[in-house]
């Protein structure tokens, strides 16, 4: 009689987390009678699997029906497999004894578990930048498996080529993650743009996922001012207005002073908005000629987004 | 270890049924086959059935087809050999073996129950 | 149903003699490449204990002066040098299909 062999057809297999995998073991005999154990790894820290004999392995089904009569078919399946069940497992014939007693171990079978990375996350500067400023983007993912990837970023649909991406860890690891810096120049268009860091994965059939952020998160456009003095609108009243244009965001504050003393203060309330997703606002105010025997100096100081006040005067002639 | 501890002695009378219990340890129950032999006093080994704990499917020797009934409890590993309409003749010492190798063989042995059937 | 014949029915061999067990199947009992024949050793108030399984392989255990050997319908279980403690009845058993027992050799010490 030949000597019983253990034959672990697959040198590799390779499955989708949470999926099943099945590690085929067949021997070619029924002599020595012994159970059949499964182990990951090799060596005197191995990890027991499967005790045919033996133990509860809840997550591990025989494949045939080991106790039917000349069964040779020692496969099994493992279920709800995730990145950590990674590694060779060894199908181990042993031979009956007090105790049992290891017989002839098969080649072994490389389990690589394909983990699809998990939603890439973009995170944008803690603080706001104005137009002309470069900004930092990051976008990160992780879990998945093998460590090939593709990572690219995007700024309205347009491909973006200043970045620094690494895959970490660099050596072996049962699962990857990927860390990506984009630089991106702001321009006062951008308030209603997104860049898009978007992931390509073996796991991911063709259908790439994307992380997105929008740059009216990042963007500060400061305004620009214009008073203009408006004709008299009734005996000795004069309206003076303080365009507010083209800012974002929305919070911003407006103080009128006369002479360098303060005259009013006010919120912006109710703006529009422009194209650009950018805002205008006007503020006015009426101003009593009569009470002024000398020129007066109207400022229009603005604070936007806790930013230094920027303010635009004008002189208001009072003829005698 | 494996271990099988089967049931105390039992007397019955004839026409009687008897329900003899074998319980397994040191090993995975619904993994292999349990057969059932008896051995008449003073005479050879006889077989009678067998079980497989993991689906209850049977194998019966003809002459012990109509009166033997092999169950098992997997929650409690215990395997049960009832026979009824007992007879004079069926006195005899009842094993219950464990196959090892699913060659329909016994490879580890309880040490025996003990039916007397006496009116 | 293949019936399983031993011989002799009892047998006396001398310590350190070799002691020779026969078993014939009505019918071979040679499938799958395999001769599906087991031989037990029981001694008085114990339950047999399986020496060789099909047919020549001593099970974990066995003192190898125990062998087994045979094809087909003719086996043999062979004790080189008779112990004190072999003393004993051995039974052959079949499993070519359902389990049946030869009817048993007692040996004893000449």
């Known amino acids: 009689e030949e000597e019983l062999q253990v034959i672990q057809p697959d040198k590799s297999v390779s499955v989708a987390a949470g999926e099943s995998a099945i590690l085929h073991c067949t021997v070619t005999s029924l002599i020595p009678v012994g159970p059949i154990q499964w182990f990951r790894g090799a060596g005197p820290a191995r990890e027991l699997i499967y005790n045919q004999k033996e133990g509860h392995f809840p997550r591990v089904t025989t494949v045939s029906e080991s106790t039917k009569r000349e069964n040779m078919d020692f496969s099994i399946s493992i279920s709800n497999i995730t990145p950590a069940d990674a590694g060779t497992y060894y199908c181990v014939k042993f031979r009956k004894g007090s105790p049992d007693t290891e017989f002839k171990s098969g080649a072994g079978t490389e389990l690589s578990v394909r983990g699809k990375p998990s939603a890439p996350v973009v995170s944008g500067p803690a603080a706001r930048a104005t137009p002309q400023h470069t900004v930092s983007f990051t976008c990160e993912s992780h879990g998945f498996s093998p460590r090939d990837i593709t990572l690219k970023w995007f700024k309205n649909g347009n491909e973006l080529s200043d970045f620094q991406t690494n895959v970490d860890p660099v050596g072996e690891s049962v699962s990857y993650s990927i860390h990506s810096t984009a630089k991106v120049v702001l321009t006062r268009e951008d308030v209603h743009s997104q860049v898009i860091c978007e992931v390509a994965h073996v796991t991911l059939q063709g259908d790439p996922l994307r992380g997105t952020a929008n740059l009216s998160e990042t963007i500060r456009v400061p305004p620009t001012l214009e008073v203009t003095q408006q004709p008299v609108r009734a005996e000795n009243q004069v309206n003076v207005t303080c365009q507010v244009r083209k800012f974002y965001p929305q919070r911003l504050q407006l103080t009128w002073l006369e002479n360098g003393n303060v005259s009013r203060t006010e919120t912006a309330s109710t703006v529009t908005e422009n194209k650009d997703g950018t805002y205008n606002w006007m503020s006015w105010l009426l101003v009593n000629v009569s009470a002024h025997r000398d020129d007066v100096k109207l400022t229009c100081q603005v604070e936007h987004d806790g930013q230094p006040a920027v303010s635009k005067s004008h002189d208001l002639k009072v003829s005698a | 270890q494996v271990q099988l501890v089967q049931s105390g002695a039992e007397v019955k009378k004839p026409g009687a049924s008897v329900k003899v219990s074998c319980k397994a340890s040191?090993?995975?129950?619904?993994?292999?086959?349990i057969n059932w032999v008896r051995q008449a006093p003073g005479q050879g080994l006889e077989w009678i059935a067998m079980?497989?704990?993991?689906?209850?499917?049977?194998h019966y020797n003809q002459i012990f087809k109509d009166r033997a009934t092999l169950t098992t409890d997997t929650s409690t590993s215990t395997a049960y050999m009832e026979l009824r309409s007992l007879r004079s003749d069926d006195t005899a010492v009842y094993y219950c073996?464990?196959?090892?190798?699913?060659?329909?063989?016994?490879?580890?042995w309880g040490r025996g129950t003990l039916v007397t059937v006496s009116s | 149903d293949i019936v399983l014949t031993q011989s002799p029915d009892s047998l006396a061999v001398s310590l350190g003699e070799r002691a020779t067990i026969n078993c014939r199947a009505s019918?071979?009992?040679?499938?799958?490449?395999?001769?599906?024949i087991f031989w037990y050793q029981q001694k008085p108030g114990q339950p047999p204990k399986l020496l060789i399984y099909?047919?020549?392989n001593r099970d974990s255990g066995v003192p190898d002066r125990f062998s087994g050997s045979g094809s087909g319908t003719d086996f043999t279980l062979t004790i080189s040098s008779l112990q004190a403690e072999d003393v004993a009845v051995y039974y052959c058993?079949?499993?070519?299909?359902?389990?049946?027992f030869g009817q048993g050799t007692k040996l004893e010490i000449k």
């Open positions: 099909l047919a020549s």
């Open positions: 073996a464990m196959d090892y190798g699913s060659l329909y063989a016994m490879d580890y």
């Open positions: 058993q079949h499993s070519r299909e359902l389990p049946t």
């Open positions: 079980i497989d704990p993991s689906d209850s499917e049977t």
């Open positions: 040191g090993y995975t129950f619904t993994n292999y086959w």
């Open positions: 019918q071979s009992v040679r499938s799958s490449g395999y001769n599906w």
